[in-house]
């Protein structure tokens, strides 16, 4: 938890989602007039996000504690989880309405459907996550979070289809981390880099987090990681407290989330 670049962070909250992202001026927060906010987005090939676009992004985890211009001179910000310091204890778009004075200074919410995105919140029964740009090499300075949330009682079976990240002894440069929880604080499973395929992982509960980070130097081929749902009925009883069976890592039961 904490602030980074003016954004309230638990890694559940995304810095970019559904093509929507937050921008502030180089000089800091709340420095942009409406015209300047439009310019900021247009300089990057985007435009000011509409209220609907901001709400769509919020629904998949976009949470920013900073009011910004939207299309048509509207100002507001997206709140996923209510907090005492942000959003007046409410969730949704905290809407300041259409501003009569376009010279007021706020941040900007941009929309760019072509923006390179990674991560998100996923509830599908199965999916493949790819490093940004895969099969091309991933970029420097990437941070992506994939949060999986299935139905209560289900588990997640993770398998690595392709894996090629910069190798260094402590996996300090580029890495994938897996957490057996809905954040990157609890339930740490492992950190992976290099080009050896890690073994499969089966969660203890219905949630899991994958984090991908790349540093500012060498890049490599990237990865594809697949997950499928394991229904309670199909789970073998031996799985419950076994750390490894064959090529699968089973995690002892710890976390379960509604």
């Amino acid at each position: 938890w904490g602030f980074k670049n003016g954004i309230f962070h638990n890694s559940i909250w995304l810095e970019q989602a559904a093509g929507v992202y937050h921008r502030e001026a180089r000089a800091g927060r709340y420095k942009l007039t409406y015209a300047e906010a439009k310019a900021v987005c247009e300089f990057e090939g985007g435009r000011l996000a509409t209220y609907k676009q901001l709400e769509a992004a919020r629904k998949i985890g976009f949470h920013v504690c900073a009011a910004g211009w939207m299309a048509k001179g509207r100002v507001g910000y997206p709140i996923v989880k209510p907090g005492p310091n942000c959003g007046f204890g409410k969730t949704g778009i905290i809407d300041y309405g259409i501003r009569l004075n376009r010279s007021e200074r706020w941040d900007a919410y941009c929309y760019n459907p072509h923006a390179k995105e990674c991560g998100g919140v996923f509830t599908d029964p199965k999916r493949i996550f790819k490093s940004p740009g895969f099969p091309n090499e991933y970029d420097d300075n990437q941070v992506c979070y994939w949060h999986i949330r299935l139905k209560y009682g289900q588990r997640i079976h993770l398998s690595f289809l392709d894996f090629d990240l910069e190798h260094d002894p402590g996996c300090l440069a580029d890495y994938v981390e897996i957490y057996d929880s809905y954040d990157d604080v609890h339930g740490f499973v492992g950190r992976y880099c290099g080009d050896e395929l890690p073994e499969d992982i089966i969660s203890t509960g219905n949630v899991m987090t994958l984090k991908f980070l790349s540093d500012a130097s060498v890049t490599a081929g990237g990865f594809q990681i697949k997950y499928v749902t394991v229904d309670p009925a199909s789970k073998s009883s031996q799985a419950k407290n076994t750390s490894t069976t064959g090529n699968k890592k089973f995690l002892p039961g710890r976390f379960s989330h509604l």
């Epitope: 921008r23 001026a25 180089r26 000089a27 420095k31 942009l32 007039t33 300047e36 310019a39 900021v40 247009e42 300089f43 990057e44 090939g45 072509h114 923006a115 390179k116 970029d139 420097d140 300075n141 500012a216 130097s217």
Partner: antibody
Framework: QVQLQQSGAELAKPGASVRLSCQAS????????MHWVKQRPRQGLEWIGY????????KCHQKFKDKATLTADKSSSTAYMQLSSLTYEDSAVYYC?????????????WGQGTTLTVSS | ENVLTQSPAIMSASPGERVTMTCSAT?????MHWYQQKSSTSPKLWIY???KLASGVPGRFSGSGSGNSYSLTISSMEAEDVATYYC?????????FGAGTKLELK
């Protein structure tokens, strides 16, 4: 330290095309934007356009949109500008210049310039 | 297009003299930046964000202004300050430079 190394002087004929290069070192290429600026002999500076290397997005001044094509190769940290259908008015020094991605923009490092001479 | 008009186009000053050059913009900008260019060399960032001196720029230089009107001042002219100074705005597309003020030694 930050360095922008530009390709050498070019001599080209009217109607031809040239590709100028700008190799960046001393910083993370994809974290900054690369702009191109034109300066004709004994004249002022004219902004041509920029590329965002991380995404490949480009934007050119309307005046240069049919003249300049901007590209970047992340693997070699090199930005390129192709100038097509050359005329005598394209004879100039061309600079690449790095800007932060933070609004409003300014150029904090410049290449040494590439002199283009268009002559028949 | 946001046209930047610099004045004077050419000026000369004696060593120790105070020098002020101005830059006016047709559209308001939040910041103005200034570049110094000496003959046959690349421009150098001199002042950014209206009043911040770039690395290595002597303290006798200062910048000020807001909205449509900005200025660069040298409190005490020195021989090494002979150059052309360009104002630049990075707030609006297209990015634009002023035509320059050429500063000579009297």
């Amino acid at each position: 330290q930050v360095q922008l190394q530009q390709s050498g002087a070019e001599l080209a004929k009217p109607g031809a095309s040239v590709r100028l290069s700008c190799q960046a070192s001393g910083y993370t290429f994809t974290s900054y934007w690369m702009h191109w600026v034109k300066q004709r002999p004994r004249q002022g500076l004219e902004w041509i356009g920029y590329i965002i290397p991380s995404s490949g997005y480009t934007k050119c001044h309307q005046k240069f949109k049919d003249k300049a094509t901007l590209t970047a190769d992340k693997s070699s940290s090199t930005a390129y500008m192709q100038l097509s259908s050359l005329t005598y008015e394209d004879s100039a020094v061309y600079y690449c210049a790095r800007s932060t991605s933070g609004y409003p923009y300014y150029f904090d490092s410049w290449g040494q310039g590439t002199t283009l001479t268009v002559s028949s | 297009e946001n046209v930047l008009t610099q004045s004077p186009a050419i000026m000369s000053a004696s060593p120790g003299e105070r020098v002020t050059m101005t830059c006016s913009a047709t559209s308001s900008v939040s910041f103005m930046h200034w570049y110094q260019q000496k003959s046959s060399t690349s421009p150098k960032l001199w002042i950014y964000d209206t009043s911040k001196l770039a690395s290595g720029v002597p303290g006798r230089f200062s910048g000020s202004g807001s909205g449509n009107s900005y200025s660069l001042t040298i409190s005490s002219m020195e021989a090494e300050d002979v150059a052309t100074y360009y104002c630049f705005q990075g707030s609006w597309y297209p990015l634009t430079f002023g035509a320059g003020t050429k500063l000579e030694l009297k």
